[in-house]
């Protein structure tokens, strides 16, 4: 049920609803405060509690930190006294918002503390290589929870030029397909930029020493990355897919990409890094299959096969929705999800997994739906449906709120309805209550009106009366009742004479240049405001300003200076505020001008 806006004067409580929460993944840096957000609405006022890694967590009781707790909110901020304090608070957090109607639950918030990035101290030996050979300069940046950006530069902060021969891989290593004496430098420096902490750190410089040779030997391509002949990758639906092939050889190999299983989706594919990288935007199911890279030079080729399996984090097919119910109704919450692999769905009631609840509960779970029959006010609850697979987790809170509300008629009492004989009148009686009230219509004698087959009720309480007769005029009573009370309103019906066109316009043939007069006479109920208007081929005709084309008055239409364009159907429309009737005539204009 839905409580109509007009249903006033009854205080209805509200189960808790989470309105704001922190993102599922929260990375904090050494200088940051920890702020976890959890806001919820509800009546009576909502109480909040937190868990960390499934255990009750009380921020106020943590030692050595300052905690600011927002009033009327579950949000809190922890400020530490040293740069390492955040490490203590890493974990998976969850907020629970409760009032007497139930408990809503936030999603899992994974808090990760990122330390100040440092490259481990290492002694970097010079890399010695003969001209024409391949080489890989490793970067191996420290791990980071947030994506970082890698640059190779020299000591003058100039970027190392990259081309088909020299390229940086996704992993940050710098690959040389073959080295030239001009690559001989002592200051190849890998820089790692950490946007979260707004810091850049650099590795110890690598000294690349290239020994000159008189005879560079041609080599057929060999893959430096990936090194094996095939690999299996999982791509996530809706996310980008990046495939990379970096080859060595002399002369420098070129890279081609093929898709043996079908055409390459040209509108979504981009090739970067001199064709060494294939990027597929927004992966879909149809992108499943084999992708092959081919490295070629004059001596031969090398290949790598990527076998891509497209999987998907859980997504909603049908998210459970909160609803109000009246006593005795059946509540059904649908939780239908899709994903690859197929997600596992679990239900909670007021934040407690259903497996942990007593077995005598009246709910049943059937094909992704939680069903409660014959609900009562005590069945009010907030449910949680959670779906997870290895790629992610979905959570929805939805409440079942069972309300008991007295019957009320929302249609005004003593309304007057007017309709014309022969038409259908609709007497309104919009009632609301919980349980849903029954509605019946009675005549002035208190007898049900439904004995006359011309009277027919609608589910929304409206009474229809068809083929109205003059003696249907009178007072009618609508009675609405539920197990708490009953209420009545009165409706007055006045049946008026129907508008009739007693003499309509006649079809006619007229000469071009002449004029034509159409007349229309109608009878109206004397108590109603009559109107006669004219239409020409469906559009309203009016006397147009200074134009003398039309003259309209007293049920008479005169069309002057007839032309062929005036041919068509002309209608007299007789109307009141209650009914409309129309009579049509055809005008044909023939040649040979008249007056």
């Amino acid at each position: 049920i839905q409580i109509p806006e007009e249903y006033e004067g009854h205080h209805v409580m509200e189960p808790p609803v989470i309105t704001e929460q922190s993102p599922r993944r929260l990375v904090v840096f050494p200088t940051d405060d920890i702020s976890l957000k959890c806001e919820a609405s509800g009546k009576p006022e909502v109480q909040f509690r937190w868990t960390r890694d499934g255990v009750h967590f009380k921020p106020k009781e943590e030692l050595g930190v300052t905690v600011y707790q927002s009033p009327h909110s579950g949000s809190f901020t922890i400020t530490g006294n040293n740069s390492n304090f955040a490490q203590r608070f890493q974990g998976i957090y969850r907020c629970f918002a409760s009032n007497k109607l139930g408990t809503a639950m936030s999603h899992e918030i994974r808090l990760m503390a990122e330390g100040a990035p440092k490259w481990p101290k290492e002694t970097v030996k010079p890399v010695e290589v003969e001209e024409g050979e391949s080489v890989v300069l490793p970067c191996n940046p420290p791990p980071s929870a947030e994506p970082l950006r890698i640059y190779w530069m020299n000591s003058k902060i100039l970027h190392i030029k990259q081309d088909e021969r020299v390229t940086m891989g996704q992993n940050g290593n710098l690959y040389f397909a073959n080295v030239l004496t001009s690559d001989n430098h002592s200051d190849y420096i890998c820089h790692a930029h950490f946007p979260g902490t707004r810091t850049i750190i650099q590795k110890e410089p690598i000294d690349l020493r290239v020994k000159a040779t008189n005879s560079m030997i041609d080599r057929k391509p060999r893959l430096l990355f990936p090194t094996n002949s095939s690999s299996h990758l999982v791509a996530l639906q809706g996310q980008p897919l990046v495939l990379e092939c970096i080859a060595e050889g002399f002369p420098t190999p070129t890279i081609k990409w093929l898709r043996p299983s079908g055409p390459m989706p040209a509108d979504r594919v981009t090739y970067q890094n001199h064709n060494k990288t294939l990027q597929l935007l927004k992966v879909g199911e149809e992108d499943d299959g084999e992708y092959r890279c081919l490295a070629e030079n004059s001596l031969g080729s090398a290949r790598h096969a990527y076998y891509v399996t497209v999987e998907a984090a859980p997504y909603w097919l049908h998210k459970p929705q909160s609803h109000l119910y009246g006593p005795g109704e059946t509540a059904r919450l649908d939780c239908q999800v899709q994903g690859r692999p197929q997600p596992e769905v679990t239900w909670r009631i007021n934040g407690i997994p259903v497996e942990e609840l007593a077995k005598d509960q009246k709910y049943r779970i059937q094909r992704g739906a939680l069903i409660l029959s014959n609900v009562q006010p005590s069945d009010t609850m907030v449910t949680q449906c959670e779906a997870r697979n290895r790629h992610g987790l979905l959570l929805a809170n939805a409440y079942i709120y069972v309300v008991q509300l007295p019957a009320k008629i929302l249609t005004a009492d003593n309304q007057t309805y007017m309709a014309v004989q022969g038409s259908t009148a609709y007497l309104l009686c919009k009632a609301f209550g919980a349980p849903v009230p029954s509605v019946q219509w009675l005549d002035e004698d208190g007898t049900t009106v439904l004995q006359d087959e011309r009277f027919f009720p609608y589910a929304n309480g409206t009474l229809g009366i068809r083929d109205l007769q003059a003696n249907d005029t009178g007072r009618y009573f609508c009675l609405a009742a539920n197990d708490q009370n009953n209420v009545t309103i009165m409706a007055n019906l006045k049946v008026k004479d129907a508008t009739q066109i007693t003499q309509g316009p006649r079809s006619t043939i007229e000469k071009k240049g002449s004029r034509v007069t159409f007349t229309c006479q109608a009878s109206f109920d004397p108590s109603l405001q009559p109107s006669i208007t004219w239409r020409g081929d469906g559009r309203d005709l009016q006397e147009l300003g200074d134009s003398d084309k039309y003259f309209i008055e007293d049920g008479r239409l005169v069309i002057h200076s007839l032309d062929y364009s005036d041919q068509g159907n002309y209608s007299c429309v007789a109307s009141t505020e209650l009914d409309v009737v129309e009579s049509r005539a055809q005008l044909l204009v023939v040649g040979s001008p008249g007056p």
Epitope: I509, R515, V516, T517, T519, E553, D554, S592, G594
Partner: antibody, heavy 120, light 107 residues
Framework: QVQLVQSGAEVKKPGASVKVSCKAS????????MHWVRQAPGQGLEWIGE????????NYNERFQGRVTLTVDKSISTAYMELSRLRSDDTAVYYC?????????????WGQGTLVTVSS | DIQMTQSPSSLSASVGDRVTITCKAN??????LAWYQQKPGKAPKLLIS???NLVTGVPSRFSGSGSGKDYTLTISSLQPEDFATYYC?????????FGQGTKLEIK
């Protein structure tokens, strides 16, 4: 109720002009064309012409073209017929008549008639 | 101009008689025919328009028929007040022309 009241009888000499008036009441003057018809003594009816009081547009019987002028004064709901270069065979009763409510070019209300006598 | 020929030019009849007056045009006038009644010293009175349509207030003993060039006015049962002169008028083409009239007298 609809009424058309014409001016009184006139006696004119040949070659003179006569102007007959027709005052309308009981309806919207500008909504109906006004016709003029004459009837010589003991003879039939003859259509002279018509005028649209709304904009002054006229249509004349060619037999009278150049001699007859139809005009209106909307402010007093009056139509006029002036016939010039009178001849003795112009002696007749001159009627104004309103376009019929239900169609055009026939006449539902008539004035009482004005006798114009042309005699030397 | 379209010529309208009425016949007879005069007619004697008694109260209660059925009377027919005809009007012939020299070309097709597409039912654009009106009938008028005129009593001595009075202006004509419109009886029928569109060949067959009785004007409001005219007794139903009057009726019109015909099409093309030939039209008829019928009085089904003559009443004393019906003795008068009757004119037909075509209004298909200008100038609008009248028949020469049919004088209906008491026998």
């Amino acid at each position: 109720q609809v009424q058309l009241v014409q001016s009184g009888a006139e006696v004119k000499k040949p070659g003179a002009s006569v102007k007959v008036s027709c005052k309308a009441s009981g309806y919207t003057f500008t909504g109906y064309w006004m016709h003029w018809v004459r009837q010589a003594p003991g003879q039939g009816l003859e259509w002279i012409g018509e005028i649209n009081p709304s904009n002054g547009r006229t249509n004349y019987n060619e037999r009278f073209q150049g001699r007859v002028t139809l005009t209106v004064d909307k402010s007093i709901s009056t139509a006029y017929m002036e016939l010039s270069r009178l001849r003795s065979d112009d002696t007749a009763v001159y009627y104004c008549a309103r376009d019929y409510y239900g169609t055009s070019y026939n006449f539902d209300y008539w004035g009482q008639g004005t006798l114009v006598t042309v005699s030397s | 101009d379209i010529q309208m020929t009425q016949s007879p030019s005069s007619l004697s009849a008694s109260v209660g008689d059925r009377v027919t007056i005809t009007c012939k045009a020299n070309e097709d006038i597409n039912n654009r025919l009106a009938w008028y009644q005129q009593k001595p010293g009075k202006a004509p009175k419109l009886l029928i328009s569109g060949a067959t349509n009785l004007v409001t207030g005219v007794p139903s003993r009057f009726s019109g028929s015909g099409s093309g060039k030939d039209y008829t006015l019928t009085i089904s049962s003559l009443q004393p007040e019906d003795f008068a002169t009757y004119y037909c008028q075509q209004y298909w083409s200008t100038p609008f022309t009248f028949g020469q009239g049919t004088k209906l007298e008491i026998k």
